[in-house]
């Protein structure tokens, strides 16, 4: 996160860290807890690393440097990448992770509500992006979970800023015209959440951007509302019944 500040314990209890353990262990992506046994993240996090056993998912944590060999983590039972996601394109950058064992909810580890299907009418004015990613383009992973308040921008405006890309209706953009605040490398897969009527909702999944926090280059996020049918279908067919945090 560029231009952010430190988060507090329990402030973003749905935020998880997706880490890979090969010779060393490192944080690669963020993710959002959406049910006892489900994490929503970006499909591109798994490019070149599709093996379930190398991944460790840490939930209910604030500081990555607190993780030791004794820190509990979740393992992956199944990775479900959107069927239309292609490595050669930037579309449908969404994936579900089914955990091997369900997580108990606590003050520091609980799910984020999902938006309504095809939610286009809600005007979100209070949106935040969180993650342990770089604090500048040529930076490094941060120890303490960062947060930053970023306004949504219209898809029309976003398309103007990214003429060389196709901004689809299944993407949502956020950023300041002058730059300075944005997600960055290592924040991929993490949440863009917006507070509406006193409730936090998962509006976007951190996907991509041209550099980080550059002027007139907003961050681009996978629009969760556009994938509600897919999320429900995959979680229900796997569970027999949905266990998602849908909005009231």
């Amino acid at each position: 996160i560029v231009g952010g500040t430190n988060s507090s314990w329990g402030e973003w209890p749905w935020q998880v860290s997706l880490q890979v353990k090969l010779t060393a262990q490192r944080h690669l992506c963020g993710g959002s807890l959406i049910g006892h046994q489900w994490v929503l993240t970006a499909a591109h996090c798994f490019d070149g690393l599709p093996l379930q056993d190398v991944w460790r998912i840490y939930s209910g944590i604030l500081n990555l440097s607190d993780i030791t060999k004794d820190t509990p983590f979740s393992q992956i039972k199944e990775i479900i990448i959107h069927q239309n996601y292609k490595v050669s394109e930037g579309n449908h950058d969404i994936a579900l992770i089914k955990l091997q064992a369900p997580l108990n909810y606590t003050e520091f580890q609980k799910p984020i509500c999902l938006p309504s299907k095809g939610d286009t009418s809600t005007i979100y004015t209070n949106c935040w992006v969180t993650g342990w990613g770089f604090s500048k383009e040529k930076g490094e992973i941060q120890n303490i979970l960062q947060k930053v308040n970023i306004p949504l921008v219209t898809n029309e405006e976003c398309q103007k800023r990214y003429q060389d890309y196709k901004i689809t209706q299944r993407m949502v953009c956020a950023g300041y015209k002058e730059g300075g605040k944005d997600a960055c490398k290592g924040d991929s897969g993490g949440p863009l959440v917006c507070k509406h009527n006193g409730m936090w909702r998962l509006v976007g999944i951190t996907s991509w951007g041209e550099g980080c926090a550059r002027r007139e280059q907003p961050g681009v996020y996978t629009k969760v509302a556009e994938y509600m049918d897919w999320i429900l279908e995959k979680t229900q067919s796997s569970d027999g019944k949905a266990q998602m945090q849908s909005p009231a």
Epitope: D47, S88, E89, G90, Q159, Q163, Y165, A183, C184, E210
Partner: antibody, heavy 125, light 108 residues
Framework: EVQLLESGGGLVQPGGSLRLSCAAS????????MTWVRQAPGKGLEWVSY????????IYADSVKGRFTISRDNSKNTLYLQMNSLRAEDTAVYYC??????????????????WGQGTLVTVSS | DIQMTQSPGTLSLSPGERATLSCRTS???????LAWYQQTPGQAPRLLIY???SRATGIPDRFSGTGYGTDFTLTISRLEPEDYGTYYC?????????FGQGTRVEIK
Amino acid sequence: EVQLLESGGGLVQPGGSLRLSCAASGFTFSHYLMTWVRQAPGKGLEWVSYISPSGGHTIYADSVKGRFTISRDNSKNTLYLQMNSLRAEDTAVYYCASVARGIAARSRTSYFNQWGQGTLVTVSS
Amino acid sequence: DIQMTQSPGTLSLSPGERATLSCRTSQFVNSNYLAWYQQTPGQAPRLLIYGASSRATGIPDRFSGTGYGTDFTLTISRLEPEDYGTYYCQQSSRTPWTFGQGTRVEIK
């Protein structure tokens, strides 16, 4: 199956014009940035031009700027290169290619993932 | 413009040998925008490596790419008869997009 098929090459006199076409199939053409690359006989590859998915943004190599125009018709899944004021040094095989732009570590990638078979343009009197 | 300098110009090797091809750039190139292509006579180029180190679909694992910043390398661990041809590195980090002049890998 992804296919790119160039046409329109041939022999033309210096100062003449030619229009190359590239018919695309097997992928969502309107989502892809498209490019032209050329290769003079016995030489290396030279990037010529690219066009954004919507067609609203174009960039050219200095060697062709002001003489060549890239365009596309997304309804016909076709890419074009209009070449005017042709010179002997424009003699080359012209390839069209789709530019893949995936995502890696929150940044986009960029590479020419599919190429046509090429069409030969010969500029000679 | 970003200049791409490949070395050596020609590499004469026997089947089974290891080939190491270098590509140097005149300015910093984001690895995500660095690709390698193979071209055999009379054929269109074929994508081998993208993002400096990711193998394209269908490319055998004897091909690998490494590098960062201004120095990039393509390695063919054990040359097969079909690997002979010309190899190009290319950047699309900044326009004009540029190719290296190519390295020809020939049978010794």
